[in-house]
C-alpha cells in the first residue's frame, strides 16, 4: 500500500486524508508549516514524516531529525540536541544522560575497559560525581544549572528534560 491516497489533484477529500492519517499528516493545501519531525511535501500538498526522506537528504527541514535518527542507530552514541551532534557515550560515562545508561553502566561493570580517570572515579577519587546520578542524569532535580555540554549556558529543569528526551 502506498500509504497515501491521491494528492489534492487526484481527488481524495481532506476528510478522507485525515482518516488515513490520524497523526495529522494533512495540513491543508495552503498551509506550509508542519508539526515537528515532518516536512511539507510540495508534490503531495501534505506534511510527511521526515523518516521517509532521511535516505535522500532532500529536505533541509529534516536535517536535525535525520541526524538524530541515524545517531540513535549507532550503538554507544546519543544525539545532543543542544550541540546538534552525535556524541559518544564513552566520552561522558559517569556524567551521562539516560540514553547512555545502558552503555555506561555495562562499561562500569567491567572496570578493565575503563580509562584511568573513570577507574579513579569508581573508587571515589573524583569528589563531585560520587552521588552516582551523574551530571546529566541529576540535572532535572537541580533546577537551573549550567549545561554540561555547553558550560556557559543556563537551563531550566524543563529545558534539560526536553533537550535530553529521545
Amino acid at each position: 500500500m502506498s500509504g497515501l491516497g491521491r494528492s489534492r489533484r487526484g481527488g481524495r477529500s481532506r476528510v478522507d486524508q485525515e482518516e488515513r492519517f490520524p497523526q495529522g499528516l494533512w495540513t491543508g493545501v495552503a498551509m506550509r508549516s508542519c508539526p515537528e519531525e515532518q516536512y511539507w511535501d510540495p508534490l503531495l500538498g501534505t506534511c510527511m514524516s521526515c523518516k521517509t526522506i532521511c535516505n535522500h537528504q532532500s529536505q533541509r527541514t529534516c536535517a536535525a531529525f535525520c541526524r538524530s535518527l541515524s545517531c540513535r542507530k549507532e550503538q554507544g552514541k546519543f544525539y545532543d540536541h543542544l550541540l546538534r551532534d552525535c556524541i559518544s557515550c564513552a566520552s561522558i560515562c559517569g556524567q551521562h544522560p539516560k540514553q547512555c545508561a545502558y552503555f555506561c553502566e555495562n562499561k562500569l561493570r567491567s572496570p578493565v575497559n575503563l580509562p584511568p580517570e573513570l577507574r579513579r572515579q569508581r573508587s571515589g577519587e573524583v569528589e563531585n560525581n560520587s552521588d552516582n546520578s551523574g551530571r546529566y542524569q541529576g540535572l532535572e532535580h537541580r533546577g537551573s544549572e549550567a549545561s554540561p555540554a555547553l558550560p556557559g549556558l543556563k537551563l531550566s529543569a524543563d529545558q534539560v528534560a526536553l533537550v535530553y528526551s529521545t
Epitope: 500500500m1 502506498s2 500509504g3 497515501l4 487526484g10 523518516k51 521517509t52 537528504q57 532532500s58 533541509r60
Partner: antibody, heavy 117, light 111 residues
Framework: DVQLQESGPGLVKPSQSLSLTCTVS?????????WHWIRQFPGNKLEWVGY???????RYNPSLNSRISITRDTSKNQFFLQLKSVTTEDTATYFC??????????WGLGTTLTVSS | GIVLTQSPPSLAVSLGQRATISCRAS??????????MNWFQQKPGQPPKLLIY???NQGSGVPARFSGSGSGTDFSLNIHPMEEDDTAMYFC?????????FGGGTKLEIK
C-alpha cells in the same frame, strides 16, 4: 520556476576525464533539496549517477563510485559531475535533475556525451 | 540495488482504450507505509516527466487519465482513455533507497 541546464564537451577520448556542468536558475542549490545526475544510454536505459545535497553532502552510484565526483560552485549556483577514465560505455545523454522529497520533479534537457577515439 | 523489471517492453493500444504497464521490483519498495515508486513519461528529445509519485499520486498538471497503483513489489500504470499525445516511453523508478533505479522502459504506441 526552477530551471536546470547541462553543458559539457560533447566528445571525449577514451581514458580521459570529463566534467559536466549543471547551471540552476530560479532556485538556490544551497537552500534545499538534492541535486542529481542521471544518464540515459543509447537504447533508452536510465541510470542514476549520484547527487549533491543542499548541504554539500554527496552520494554516488556504487557502480561508478571509484570514478566519479560531484561538486558545486555555490557562487554560480552550479553543480558538476567529474568522471575519470571514461570508456565507450560512458557514451550517454547526461541529465541533471532536482529531487524534492523522494522524486525527480525538475530536469534539464540533457547534454550528449560521446566517448570515441 | 533494487532491480525493476518493466513489462511489456512495447505496447500498441487503440485510441480510447486502456493501456496497462507493469513494474516488478526485486524487493519491496515500501517503507513507513509508503510505496516509493514513481512513474515517468519521456518523449523523444525531452527529459523524463514525472507522472505518478509514490505509487498513486499524480504529478503536477498530469491528466486524470493517468493513474498508478500497487504496493510492495508489484505496481502498474494505467492510461485510460488512450490519446494520441500519450505515445511515448514510460519508466518506473524506485526511490526507497540509494542507488535509485529505473525500469527498462515501455514504448507505448497507437494501434
Amino acid at each position: 520556476d526552477v530551471q536546470l541546464q547541462e553543458s559539457g564537451p560533447g566528445l571525449v577520448k577514451p581514458s580521459q576525464s570529463l566534467s559536466l556542468t549543471c547551471t540552476v536558475s530560479g532556485f538556490s542549490i544551497t537552500s534545499d533539496y538534492a541535486w542529481h545526475w542521471i544518464r540515459q544510454f543509447p537504447g533508452n536505459k536510465l541510470e542514476w549517477v549520484g547527487y549533491i545535497s543542499y548541504s554539500g553532502s554527496t552520494r554516488y552510484n556504487p557502480s561508478l563510485n571509484s570514478r566519479i565526483s560531484i561538486t558545486r560552485d555555490t557562487s554560480k549556483n552550479q553543480f558538476f559531475l567529474q568522471l575519470k577514465s571514461v570508456t565507450t560505455e560512458d557514451t550517454a545523454t547526461y541529465f541533471c535533475a532536482r529531487v524534492v522529497s523522494t522524486s525527480f520533479d525538475s530536469w534539464g534537457l540533457g547534454t550528449t556525451l560521446t566517448v570515441s577515439s | 540495488g533494487i532491480v525493476l523489471t518493466q513489462s511489456p517492453p512495447s505496447l500498441a493500444v487503440s485510441l480510447g482504450q486502456r493501456a496497462t504497464i507493469s513494474c516488478r521490483a526485486s524487493e519491496s519498495v515500501d517503507n513507513y507505509g509508503i510505496s516509493f515508486m514513481n512513474w515517468f513519461q519521456q518523449k523523444p528529445g525531452q527529459p523524463p516527466k514525472l507522472l505518478i509519485y509514490v505509487a498513486s499520486n499524480q504529478g503536477s498538471g498530469v491528466p486524470a487519465r493517468f493513474s498508478g497503483s500497487g504496493s510492495g513489489t508489484d505496481f502498474s500504470l494505467n492510461i485510460h482513455p488512450m490519446e494520441e499525445d500519450d505515445t511515448a516511453m514510460y519508466f518506473c523508478q524506485q526511490s526507497k533507497e540509494v542507488p535509485y533505479t529505473f525500469g527498462g522502459g515501455t514504448k507505448l504506441e497507437i494501434k
